[in-house]
Interface confidence: low
Amino acid sequence: DSEEDEEHTIITDTELPPLKLMHSFCAFKADDGPCKAIMKRFFFNIFTRQCEEFIYGGCEGNQNRFESLEECKKMCTRDNANRIIKTTLQQEKPDFCFLEEDPGICRGYITRYFYNNQTKQCERFKYGGCLGNMNNFETLEECKNICEDGPNGFQVDNYGTQLNAVNNSLTPQSTKVPSLFEFHGPSWCLTPADRGLCRANENRFYYNSVIGKCRPFKYSGCGGNENNFTSKQECLRACKKGFIQRISKGGLIKTKRKRKKQRVKIAYEEIFVKNM
C-alpha cells in the first residue's frame, strides 16, 4: 500500500498533549505474564513514547505486546517518527481564560496570575497550591501570551508566533514546546502506576499524564506511590485540573484588523525526530 509511505507535513487540529493513542492497549504497562519463558517482545512505552523491548513469559499478559519493533510502531505510533509539534497560530482565547480566579482549597498562598475578563488583563492572585482551575499561570508573561489580546488586537501564542498584519505571513519566533502544556498539578500525578509489593488485587485509579486521563490499575495492597486513588473522581480532582490541554477547539481564529475580518485555519508544523 503506497499510502503507508505518504508524508504528513501538515496536520490540522492535532491535539497537543496528552498523547493521542491509536488504541487503548498501547497505554498498558508491559506485562510479562505469570509463565517463565524468556521471549523477546516489544511494547509501547507511553512515558518515553517509544516502542521498547521487554521479556515476555510466554502466557497471558496483555495486548501491548508485539513480536517486532515494526509491528509495535505500526500499532501504537501515529507515524514512524516522534514529533515535536508547534502551533503556528492560536485560537482567539481558550475557554479557561474566562473562568474566575480560584485559589483552591489549600493554604500554600503562592503568587500566580489569572486573566480578569472584566479588566481584560492579567492580574496577580494568591493560589492555595491545589485544585482551582486552569486560569492560573506561573508568570505574567504566560498569562498575557495565552489570554490577553496582542498589541495589535490579535493573539500572540507561546512561541511568539505572530500574524504579520501586512502580508498575513506566519512568523514563528521559537520552536520550544510552550509552557502552556506543562503540568501544574501535584508531582505524583506524573509518576507511573505502581502495583506495589503485596498480593492483593484492589481496583484503583492512577493519572496517566501522557494520555491525560485517569485509568484503572490493580493495586497489590501495599507499597506503590501516591498516584493511587480509590475512585476515578478522586483521581480527576487531584490531577486532571493540573494539565492544561488543548487551546484550539474549532480550529479557527478571528484576526482583529481594520479591514475585512479574516478567518485563519490553525496549522501544525511538524519537526520529525527520527529516533524510533
Partner: antibody, heavy 119, light 107 residues
Framework: EVQLVESGGGLVQPGGSLRLSCAAS????????LDWVRQAPGKGLEWVAD????????LYNQKFKGRFTISRDNAKNSAYLQMNSLRAEDTAVYYC????????????WGQGTLVTVSS | DIVMTQSHKFMSTSVGDRVSITCKAS??????VAWYQQKPGQSPRLLIY???TRHTGVPDRFTGCGSGTDYTLTISSVQAEDLALYYC?????????FGGGTKLEMK
C-alpha cells in the same frame, strides 16, 4: 455534523468479492480511526476491523483476517472494506463507525449497507 | 477472545420503571466497557463509554457502572423512546467484542 455513509453492498454469489466504501464528513478525517462492524439479520454486533487514517495501521478480528482487507484514501476522506471469498454467513448489514481514541468507543455510526451472499 | 454475556435477551418494563441491564465479561476488562442503544431499522448509538461516562447528549437517566467482569446499564425512569436493543462492548483488547444484546420491551 459528523456523517458516515456506507455504500457498495448488494447481492453476491458465494466465493465472490465486494468492496464497501465509507465516506466520512463533518470532522478532520485523520483525527479518528475508522472501524467496520457487521450485524447478521436478527443477530448481534460483530467487530470486523479498524484503520488509523494517518499511517494506515490496521487491526483485524482474526476471524476475518485474510479474507477481508480494510484500507483508506485520505484524499477522499473514505475507508474501504474489501471482502473476498464471501460465504452465506457473511450476509449482514455492514456498518462503518468512527472510533474515538479518547473514549475507546465508536461514537458515530453510518446507516449501514446490506451485503447478501446467496446463489 | 473475551466473551461478553448479557444474560437477559429480553426485559419487560413500563414507563417510569427503573431497569438494570447487566453484562458479564469472561475476564477482567478493567472498566473498558461501552454501551450502545439500537432501535429497529437504525444504527447503534453510543450511550456510555469507560463503563460509567455518558456520551454527549445522552439523557442523565442512563447510568453505567461496574468493574472487573461485571457491568450494568441502568435507566432510572424508562421512557417510551428507550424501548430498544442494548449492547455492551469491551474495548480492553482486540477483537473488540459485543454482548448478545438485551431487548427492552413494554409489559
Amino acid at each position: 455534523e459528523v456523517q458516515l455513509v456506507e455504500s457498495g453492498g448488494g447481492l453476491v454469489q458465494p466465493g465472490g468479492s465486494l468492496r464497501l466504501s465509507c465516506a466520512a464528513s463533518g470532522y478532520t478525517f485523520t483525527d479518528y480511526n475508522l472501524d467496520w462492524v457487521r450485524q447478521a439479520p436478527g443477530k448481534g454486533l460483530e467487530w470486523v476491523a479498524d484503520i488509523n487514517p494517518i499511517n494506515g495501521a490496521t487491526l483485524y478480528n482474526q476471524k476475518f483476517k485474510g479474507r477481508f482487507t480494510i484500507s483508506r484514501d485520505n484524499a477522499k476522506n473514505s475507508a474501504y472494506l474489501q471482502m473476498n471469498s464471501l460465504r452465506a454467513e457473511d450476509t449482514a448489514v455492514y456498518y462503518c463507525a468512527r472510533y474515538y481514541g479518547d473514549y475507546d468507543a465508536m461514537d458515530y455510526w453510518g446507516q449501514g449497507t446490506l451485503v447478501t451472499v446467496s446463489s | 477472545d473475551i466473551v461478553m454475556t448479557q444474560s437477559h435477551k429480553f426485559m419487560s418494563t413500563s414507563v417510569g420503571d427503573r431497569v438494570s441491564i447487566t453484562c458479564k465479561a469472561s475476564q477482567d476488562v478493567h472498566t473498558a466497557v461501552a454501551w450502545y442503544q439500537q432501535k429497529p431499522g437504525q444504527s447503534p448509538r453510543l450511550l456510555i463509554y469507560w463503563a460509567s461516562t455518558r456520551h454527549t447528549g445522552v439523557p442523565d437517566r442512563f447510568t453505567g457502572c461496574g468493574s472487573g467482569t461485571d457491568y450494568t446499564l441502568t435507566i432510572s425512569s424508562v421512557q417510551a423512546e428507550d424501548l430498544a436493543l442494548y449492547y455492551c462492548q469491551q474495548h480492553y483488547t482486540t477483537p473488540y467484542t459485543f454482548g448478545g444484546g438485551t431487548k427492552l420491551e413494554m409489559k
